[in-house]
């Protein structure tokens, strides 16, 4: 959950408590288990080669 009093994240990003900032949903492709990815709609999983080249 986003910290009280903080501005909402812009489109394509979601609040990360771990990073204490808005984070790019695009990065969920490489790091799908990041805390903020739950707030990103339909983030695609990483391709097989990116995770295990």
């Amino acid at each position: 959950e986003q910290a009280p009093g903080t501005a909402p994240c812009s489109r394509g990003s979601s609040w990360s408590a771990d990073l204490d900032k808005c984070a790019d949903c695009a990065s969920c492709r490489a790091r799908p288990h990041s805390d903020f990815c739950l707030g990103c709609a339909a983030a695609p999983p990483a391709p097989f080669r990116l995770l295990w080249p």
Epitope: G12, L19, D24, A26, A30, R31, H33, P44, R49
Partner: antibody, heavy 119, light 111 residues
Framework: QVELVESGGGLVQPGGSLRLSCAAS????????MSWVRQAPGKGLEWVAE??????????HYAESVKGRFTISRDDSKNSLYLQMNSLRAEDTAVYYC??????????WGQGTLVTVSS | DIQMTQSPSSLSASVGDRVTITCRAS??????????MHWYQQKPGKAPKLLIK???NLESGVPSRFSGSGSGTDFTLTISSLQPEDFATYYC?????????FGGGTKVEIK
């Protein structure tokens, strides 16, 4: 503020070894992927090696040009990144940059350290 | 490996000019939602600096005269009104897969 400071560069003979270090501060080092990127004199940027997180079993990846010769490592307790370079060649001469990123785009860069391989 | 082709390799422009740099990847670096293309600025003797990530997301603190666009294989970095501090070399980079590769760079010089 974020700071990445490389050290360990210098002049080395072909076939020699060198170990580069990068001291990080100002961000949660253990949460960030780290890479080394190099730039030969007057040339463009070349990605060299990457190391991921403890949760990824510190997975490493290398450019073909350095595979088997270079080893990337990190010490999260010291907020430090390393590059062990063995069997150095003239074509490894470059400024070596330490970079940090959560994923994808390289947000943080050090000032670079020059490695010169020459006899 | 994905090859990145940047053009032009150099250009001369005046303060106030609109400048466009293109980058073409040898294969698509986009999903239906995001493009894994990034742009950096490098000044002589300095480290590169991230300007734009994911094709069009301006990095915090970067002036709004910089913008990025494109998807698939073709991407563009635009400087709407060139300022004296913008004379530098610009690089694109993909993060679609390993190895990450950079374009050859575009040097923006003073006319």
């Amino acid at each position: 503020q974020v700071e990445l400071v490389e050290s360990g560069g210098g002049l080395v003979q072909p076939g020699g070894s060198l170990r580069l270090s990068c001291a990080a501060s100002g961000f949660t080092f253990s949460s960030y992927w780290m890479s080394w990127v190099r730039q030969a004199p007057g040339k463009g940027l070349e990605w060299v090696a990457e190391i991921r997180l403890k949760s990824d079993n510190y997975a490493t990846h290398y450019a073909e040009s350095v595979k088997g010769r270079f080893t990337i490592s990190r010490d999260d307790s010291k907020n430090s990144l390393y590059l062990q370079m063995n069997s150095l060649r003239a074509e490894d001469t470059a400024v070596y940059y330490c970079t940090g990123y959560y994923a994808d785009a390289m947000d943080y860069w050090g000032q670079g350290t020059l490695v010169t391989v020459s006899s | 490996d994905i090859q990145m082709t940047q053009s032009p390799s150099s250009l001369s422009a005046s303060v106030g000019d609109r400048v466009t740099i293109t980058c073409r990847a040898s294969q698509s670096v986009s999903t239906s939602s995001y493009s894994y293309m990034h742009w950096y600025q490098q000044k002589p003797g300095k480290a590169p600096k991230l300007l734009i990530k994911y094709a069009s997301n301006l990095e915090s603190g970067v002036p709004s005269r910089f913008s990025g666009s494109g998807s698939g294989t073709d991407f563009t970095l635009t400087i709407s009104s060139l300022q004296p501090e913008d004379f530098a070399t610009y690089y694109c980079q993909h993060s679609w897969e390993i190895p990450y590769t950079f374009g050859g760079g575009t040097k923006v010089e003073i006319k």
